[in-house]
């Protein structure tokens, strides 16, 4: 039998400074774009190699974002969510929310929707 | 992991048209930036196309004459090439990323691209 597959959600605040190549990920989500079955969030798809989000190390790809620099990313379209980010300054705070897979029993298995699948 | 698989070259007149294809593997076809570049023998790698959520973007030597799109329910990207000219053959590679650069995108960049395919040949004779 198989064991349940939990996940322990926690939250982070990331400060992140703008490099000369930007922010250094890719998203996908939004109202027009449901990455994760009935959920319209923004998630990260990719952290590029020695960009600013990699070298800084706590963005994470399969990580939800929240908010960024305080404006709440709920019900937005993905093309919007996108110039929000490309927008946002040289200074950007991120609220982003970790999904840590936590397996109970001895086989666990990857949920379907997962985002980091 | 993406795998892509690149299918309908082959040898065509100088005037002609050819319609490629690039198959992808994965879930979640519709959120991937996808493009096609080529490789003409003893060249660099070339950008020829690309297609993101937003919009299209073409290289100025194939503009108006081929022409990129996608069918989300099939998992498949195309190329169309009309108007096709000797200096048009190469090794027609297929390129993604999953989601949508927060930076400014670069479509002719070949690290915006995590997955590439093998490559279909397109010869065009005069």
């Known amino acids: 039998m198989n064991g349940r597959v939990d996940y322990l959600v926690t939250e982070e605040e990331i400060n992140l400074t703008r490099g000369p190549s930007g922010l250094g990920f890719n998203i996908v989500g939004g109202t027009d774009q449901q990455y994760v079955s009935n959920d319209s969030g923004i998630y990260v798809s990719r952290i590029k190699e020695n960009g600013a989000a990699a070298l800084d190390g706590r963005l994470q790809e399969g990580d939800k974002i929240l908010s960024v620099n305080g404006q709440d990313l709920k019900n937005l379209l993905h093309q919007d969510a996108v110039d929000l980010f490309r927008n946002a300054g040289y200074a950007v705070s991120l609220r982003v929310q970790h999904r840590l897979q936590v397996q109970n029993g001895p086989i666990g298995h990857r949920g379907e929707g997962d985002p980091s699948g | 992991h993406v795998q892509l698989v690149e299918s309908g070259g082959g040898l065509v007149q100088a005037g002609g048209s050819l319609r490629l294809s690039c198959t992808a593997s994965?879930?979640?076809?519709?959120?991937?930036?996808m493009a096609w570049f080529r490789q003409a023998p003893g060249k660099e790698r070339e950008f020829v196309a690309a297609i993101t959520w937003s919009g299209t973007y073409y290289a100025d030597s194939v503009k108006g004459r081929f022409t990129i799109s996608r069918d989300n329910a099939k998992n498949t990207m195309y190329l169309q090439m009309n108007s096709l000219k000797p200096e048009d053959t190469a090794v027609y590679i297929c390129a993604a990323v999953i989601g949508s650069t927060v930076d400014s995108y670069s479509p002719s960049d070949p690290l915006e691209y995590d997955y590439w395919g093998q490559g279909t040949q397109v010869t065009v004779s005069s």
């Open positions: 994965g879930r979640t076809f519709s959120t991937y930036t």
